[in-house]
């Protein structure tokens, strides 16, 4: 069964910077990845980045850089914008659309007692969606 993993990491050098890493574990080719702030019901809320293998990347502040790490994983660097962007308490969701499996989504957040430079363990809690 395909799975999506999510890691949220605070940068050791810049305490106001965070990186979200997401990956897809399963067969098939990735046609689209959407990263969003978590919303109600544990699913993605508002988009922060959309990555397409051929059409490129759209991203929205506070996202700084979205990129492919491998053919099945991506990273999104975020810039904390102060008190109104409580990344430490925020959920991030990654949704992978793959052919022929369909869409798989998982969410993760920074652990409450994260040391800078340490990442959250993978959290493959797939939300099955027949999109």
């Amino acid at each position: 069964t395909p799975e999506v993993w999510v890691q949220v990491q605070m940068e050791a050098t810049e305490l106001s910077s965070f990186t979200v890493h997401c990956g897809f574990l399963g067969p098939g080719s990735i046609s689209l990845v959407t990263v969003s702030w978590g919303g109600p019901d544990g699913a993605g809320g508002t988009k922060l980045a959309v990555l397409h293998p051929e059409l490129g990347t759209r991203q929205w502040a506070p996202a700084r850089q979205a990129r492919w790490e491998t053919q099945s994983s991506i990273s999104l660097a975020l810039e904390d914008s102060g008190a109104s962007s409580p990344f430490a308490n925020t959920t991030f969701c990654c949704k992978f659309a793959s052919f022929p499996e369909g869409s798989w989504e998982s969410c993760g957040s920074l652990p409450p007692s994260s040391d800078p430079g340490l990442s959250a363990p993978p959290t493959p809690v797939p939300i099955l969606r027949a999109d």
């Epitope: 969003s36 702030w37 919303g39 809320g45 914008s81 102060g82 109104s84 962007s85 409580p86």
Partner: antibody
Framework: EVQLQQSGPEPVKPGASVKISCKAS????????IHWVRQSHGKSLEWIGY????????GYNQKFKSKATLTVDSSSSTAYMELRSLTSEDSAVYYC?????????????WGQGTSVTVSS | DIQMTQSPASLSASVGETVTITCRAS??????LAWYQQKQGKSPQLLVY???TLAEGVPSRFSGSGSGTQFSLKINSLQPEDFGSYYC?????????FGGGTKLETK
């Protein structure tokens, strides 16, 4: 009926701060982002930033990052923008507008605007 | 940042005429473009999103077209209520930027 009701005109002194509000009604507040846009007299529109009401997360135009702070009070369905260290260059009409979370449909409802006049 | 260039800056036309406003993006924004109308002393109103989809309640005399870097807004058979300013805006990603505007005046 969807409405974004903004606070009234603000005459302020140079160097001061001002906080303007945008009260949403007629829809579920956390289902839409709230954006803020500036229009100086007789000029075009400039995007300042947005806030996601569900978690209070904000994204800013780098140009306004040291000028504006966006917050929300979900219990009253109200978004706020605080502007600091005001100069005459900041005299403008400031609008709030909503955008659905998928970000594919533009800003479909706008507030009536709040006029900020910076003068000694 | 993506720059949006609108032309013409101003335009005079009469009721019943057809006018076209153009907008150029400094890089490919696919179809992520919106058009807004603003009347004097009022807030902007969404007319078109995704380059060619009319917003709810917008009369069919308005039409948007284009993709990539070149876009246009066409108004057929101008009505008295159509005079005002028009702005394009990309929604490809932030920072969102607007065109300089086109002021449509009565001839």
């Amino acid at each position: 009926e969807v409405q974004l009701q903004q606070s009234g005109p603000e005459p302020v002194k140079p160097g001061a701060s001002v906080k303007i509000s945008c009260k949403a009604s007629g829809y579920t507040f956390t289902d839409y982002n709230i954006h803020w846009v500036r229009q100086s007299h007789g000029k075009s529109l400039e995007w300042i930033g947005y806030i996601y009401p569900y978690n209070g997360g904000a994204g800013y135009n780098q140009k306004f990052k040291s000028k504006a702070t966006l917050t929300v009070d979900s219990s009253s369905s109200t978004a706020y923008m605080e502007l600091r260290s005001l100069t005459s260059e900041d005299s403008a009409v400031y609008y709030c507008a909503r955008e659905e979370l998928r970000r594919d449909y533009g800003m479909d409802y706008w507030g009536q605007g709040t006029s900020v006049t910076v003068s000694s | 940042d993506i720059q949006m260039t609108q032309s013409p800056a101003s335009l005079s036309a009469s009721v019943g005429e057809t006018v076209t406003i153009t907008c150029r993006a400094s890089e490919n924004i696919y179809s992520y473009l919106a058009w807004y109308q603003q009347k004097q002393g009022k807030s902007p109103q969404l007319l078109v999103y995704n380059a060619k989809t009319l917003a709810e309640g917008v009369p069919s005399r308005f039409s948007g077209s284009g993709s990539g870097t070149q876009f246009s807004l066409k108004i057929n058979s101008l009505q008295p209520e159509d005079f005002g300013s028009y702005y394009c805006q990309h929604h490809y990603g932030t920072p969102y930027t607007f065109g300089g505007g086109t002021k449509l005046e009565t001839k």
